[in-house]
Amino acid sequence: AAPCPDACCPHGSSGLRCTRDGALDSLHHLPGAENLTELYIENQQHLQHLELRDLRGLGELRNLTIVKSGLRFVAPDAFHFTPRLSRLNLSFNALESLSWKTVQGLSLQELVLSGNPLHCSCALRWLQRWEEEGLGGVPEQKLQCHGQGPLAHMPNASCGVPTLKVQVPNASVDVGDDVLLRCQVEGRGLEQAGWILTELEQSATVMKSGGLPSLGLTLANVTSDLNRKNVTCWAENDVGRAEVSVQVNVSFPASVQLHTAVEMHHWCIPFSVDGQPAPSLRWLFNGSVLNETSFIFTEFLEPAANETVRHGCLRLNQPTHVNNGNYTLLAANPFGQASASIMAAFMDNPFEFNPEDPIPVSFSPVDTNSTSGDPVEKKDETPFGVSVAVG
């Protein structure tokens, strides 16, 4: 094949090599960019910055090598459009630092930075951590900070992410109230901060105020939907990102729903209860308090993390006709009470038959040798006998 005269030449089926001295000053408009998986750049002293726009359209890129060039700055979002990047070699350039944001979101198997005049400060604490934890092949490089010494020796006691404190109202919050939250941010080198409110949707009208180091957030005209929803304050500095989530408890009265009994492994009378604070529950059977036992008990389903409503069952273990009747669930909290009732019929009463129709019945004693504790059916000699164990 004839030698390639261009600044960049194909390499394999989806690679590109740019090695002609000083031919590039940016990575715009690389040929066949959208299908590239490998890009090798060398001896490009005019290539000094790597920005977001440089790698746009390189969505398939997996290996990027820029070596022995003039790279001085890599933007924190430079690799936003290359999420599949797994190998990054930036050795022998002029990099003094590299932000933690640059590699965030990438699954780098290899990161090579040797031969750069790195400068140790808290901004490289993340890289020191990679070295400590054996990530990305960093320990083998024995990285040095120019004029200082090994990265491994950099003091890091003061290199912390921001500290966040979110103040929420002490008093109870009612539906329709306005709530003021304040996020206090402390730490060195604070860069950005804000609120994450994605869970809130229609739970309140949101107004943000203030800026670093004290951010305000007003949630106006709150609804009960706000309960269990995360309101998150975040802040970033050159070391990393911190987040703190809080929830605002909006008080509202108890409510309850009952559904028709269903037969599963045991019988279940399904219910849903809601309210803030969480209501206390009591069951009535035919108007009298139902004392729960190992045969009749309340069981809750795993609660959803982002809502107050609780679903569950009144479980009945092999109920008989004596369990037929009216079931009422009472729910109460300091803001109100509610009840719901449902008729449940688990088994027809075997004694409710027409006396004109003689049906011989024998009662079998419970087998005293049984260890299960459940009634045991005994076979009777009478061919038409019905054996009933009374529970």
Partner: antibody
Framework: QVQLVQSGAEVKKPGASVKVSCKAS????????MHWVRQAPGQGLEWIGT????????SLAQKFQGRVTLTRDTSTSTAYMELSSLRSEDTAVYYC????????????WGQGTTVTVSS | DIQMTQSPSSLSASVGDRVTITCRAS?????LYWFQQKPGKAPKPLIY???SLGSGVPSRFSGSGSGTDYTLTISSLQPEDFATYYC?????????FGGGTKVEIK
């Protein structure tokens, strides 16, 4: 103990060059970065640049690029700072100092070399 | 370059006094150094990364601060402490020094 001993005072004419030496003893010379700092009469401290004796890597303050050359001789554990095109404002005491990475600071300083630029 | 501003530029104090010198960086830095210099002598390291005492430095010296604001405190001034004090940052290139604070005898 760790010591840095600098060469003696120099008087130079404007436009000339001066080469100040800094002889290290009491530690492994090639392991630690050597820095140069100067102090004009009655003024504060000003960083000039640094050299890594292990491989001669250097870094200079922008102000001194093109006029300062940092070198070293590992056989004698000596670092050198040469300043060319001297002008009167280069009159100062020049210090060498070691950056001790174990505790991350300039721990040992030379006694200083006075360079006077005068016509 | 990060500018380092020391205050006061000079102060008069008596033996036994508590003395505080402040150093402000033009942008947030990772840590700070303090040096003591006497006339005709090389600077002597006092405090490294903000609050650690240099070798042989008496415990009456202490350093504190974070971000942009830092302090050197001498809890009880001694005769040998009359000197000029410099702060220095090395958060980014080049390392820069404060203008100095001269502590004189009242």
């Amino acid at each position: 103990q760790v010591q840095l001993v600098q060469s003696g005072a120099e008087v130079k004419k404007p436009g000339a060059s001066v080469k100040v030496s800094c002889k290290a003893s009491g530690y492994t010379f090639t392991t630690y970065w050597m820095h140069w700092v100067r102090q004009a009469p009655g003024q504060g401290l000003e960083w000039i640049g640094t050299i890594y004796p292990g491989n001669s890597d250097t870094s200079l303050a922008q102000k001194f690029q093109g006029r300062v050359t940092l070198t070293r001789d590992t056989s004698t554990s000596t670092a050198y700072m040469e300043l060319s095109s001297l002008r009167s404002e280069d009159t100062a005491v020049y210090y060498c100092t070691r950056f001790y990475f174990e505790d991350w600071y300039f721990d040992v300083w030379g006694q200083g070399t006075t360079v006077t630029v005068s016509s | 370059d990060i500018q380092m501003t020391q205050s006061p530029s000079s102060l008069s104090a008596s033996v036994g006094d508590r003395v505080t010198i402040t150093c402000r960086a033009s942008s947030s830095i990772s840590w700070l150094y303090w040096f003591q210099q006497k006339p005709g002598k090389a600077p002597k390291p006092l405090i490294y990364y903000t609050s650690s005492l240099g070798s042989g430095v008496p415990s009456r010296f202490s350093g504190s601060g974070s971000g942009t604001d830092y302090t050197l405190t001498i809890s009880s001034l001694q005769p040998e402490d009359f000197a000029t004090y410099y702060c220095q940052q090395w958060h980014s290139y080049p390392p820069t020094f404060g203008g100095g604070t001269k502590v004189e005898i009242k």
